[in-house]
């Protein structure tokens, strides 16, 4: 299995945005790579987003995806937006080398993303 490294913990911003780097130990230069972010919470695993990219090109997530990202060599910089406290959980980076063959799969240990909902602003008399 291909080694995938990602940070253990990330704290989302007050605007509900979390970014982390997913690095994979590629055996060479895959021309087509698929990156999937999985969320594990309460022993349930769900797919958050996925993108396939050609080496040297940008990651393209679906238009309605909460993820964006960029790639550089064997690193993928992932950003997840619109997070709320209930989205706190372990976010796992899965990398697949799709082409050329053979197929390689790597799954990271996960990044624990903590999301704290901002305190509502008190009403102002001004």
């Amino acid at each position: 299995a291909m080694h995938v490294a990602q940070p253990a913990v990330v704290l989302a911003s007050s605007r509900g945005i979390a970014s982390f780097v997913c690095e994979y130990a590629s055996p060479g230069k895959a021309t087509e790579v698929r990156v999937t972010v999985l969320r594990q919470a309460d022993s349930q695993v769900t797919e958050v987003c996925a993108a396939t990219y050609m080496m040297g090109n940008e990651l393209t997530f679906l238009d309605d995806s909460i993820c964006t990202g960029t790639s550089s060599g064997n690193q993928v910089n992932l950003t997840i937006q619109g997070l709320r406290a209930m989205d706190t959980g372990l976010y796992i980076c899965k990398v697949e080398l799709m082409y050329p063959p053979p197929y390689y799969l790597g799954i990271g240990n996960g990044t624990q993303i903590y999301v704290i909902d901002p305190e509502p602003c008190p009403d102002s008399d001004f």
Partner: antibody, heavy 118, light 107 residues
Framework: QVQLQESGPGLVKPSETLSLTCTVT?????????WNWIRQPAGKGLEWIGY???????YYNPSLKSRVTISRDTSKNQFSLKLSSVTAADTAVYFC???????????WGQGTTLTVSS | DIQMTQSPSSLSASVGDRVTITCRAS??????VAWYQQKPGKAPKPLIY???YRYSGVPSRFSGSGSGTDFTLTISSLQPEDFATYFC?????????FGAGTKLELK
């Protein structure tokens, strides 16, 4: 376990064509990866010669391109090197090796010594 | 072609020593660098790939670091079986190229 094994004549005369074969066991050369030839003159460094891909594609080192052909026999799971117009400078240990596309070499043959001499 | 300049070309050390071998690429190769160990009459064996990842079965005393143009192989505590020749290799760009090698000898 993947294994690669080179075979060849050992001695070739100057101006003749060198022919070497690499037999692969434990993995089909058409399933994936790139299948390479690398050489090493005595006491010197390694020089990549070229590859044949799982799909039959080739790429050769520009420094040797005019003299090199790498082909395969999929029925025998073998790939071969032909190097034409050899000179004493082609005397070396020749290795076959496997890599992912533009990747490091994870499996190697044990090498076969090729001497160019009249 | 990308030149891989390896230094030193030879090195004398003792069992237990910490040893560092360096490799400089003539242009940026990212993290696409591997290191191999070769003993006389044998094929090279992969030690490190993708700059810093140990190949399967390679002892933890071997480590790699660097990026861009400067790369290092470190052996933290030399063992008797480590006396051999070491090569760096860039696989960022074809034609694939190797360093000239570092011969590690017993002092």
């Amino acid at each position: 376990q993947v294994q690669l094994q080179e075979s060849g004549p050992g001695l070739v005369k100057p101006s003749e064509t060198l022919s070497l074969t690499c037999t692969v066991t434990g993995y089909s050369i058409t399933s994936g990866y790139y299948w390479n030839w690398i050489r090493q003159p005595a006491g010197k460094g390694l020089e990549w010669i070229g590859y044949i891909g799982y799909d039959g594609s080739n790429y050769y080192n520009p420094s040797l391109k005019s003299r090199v052909t790498i082909s395969r026999d999929t029925s025998k799971n073998q790939f071969s090197l032909k190097l034409s117009s050899v000179t004493a400078a082609d005397t070396a240990v020749y290795f076959c090796a496997r890599n992912y596309y533009s990747g490091y070499f994870d499996f190697w043959g044990q090498g076969t010594t090729l001497t160019v001499s009249s | 072609d990308i030149q891989m300049t390896q230094s030193p070309s030879s090195l004398s050390a003792s069992v237990g020593d910490r040893v560092t071998i360096t490799c400089r690429a003539s242009q940026n190769v990212g993290t696409y660098v591997a290191w191999y160990q070769q003993k006389p009459g044998k094929a090279p064996k992969p030690l490190i790939y993708s700059t810093s990842y140990r190949y399967s079965g390679v002892p933890s005393r071997f480590s790699g670091s660097g990026s861009g143009t400067d790369f290092t192989l470190t052996i933290s505590s030399l063992q008797p079986e480590d006396f051999a020749t070491y090569f760096c290799h860039q696989y960022d760009t074809y034609p694939l190229t190797f360093g000239a090698g570092t011969k590690l000898e017993l002092k």
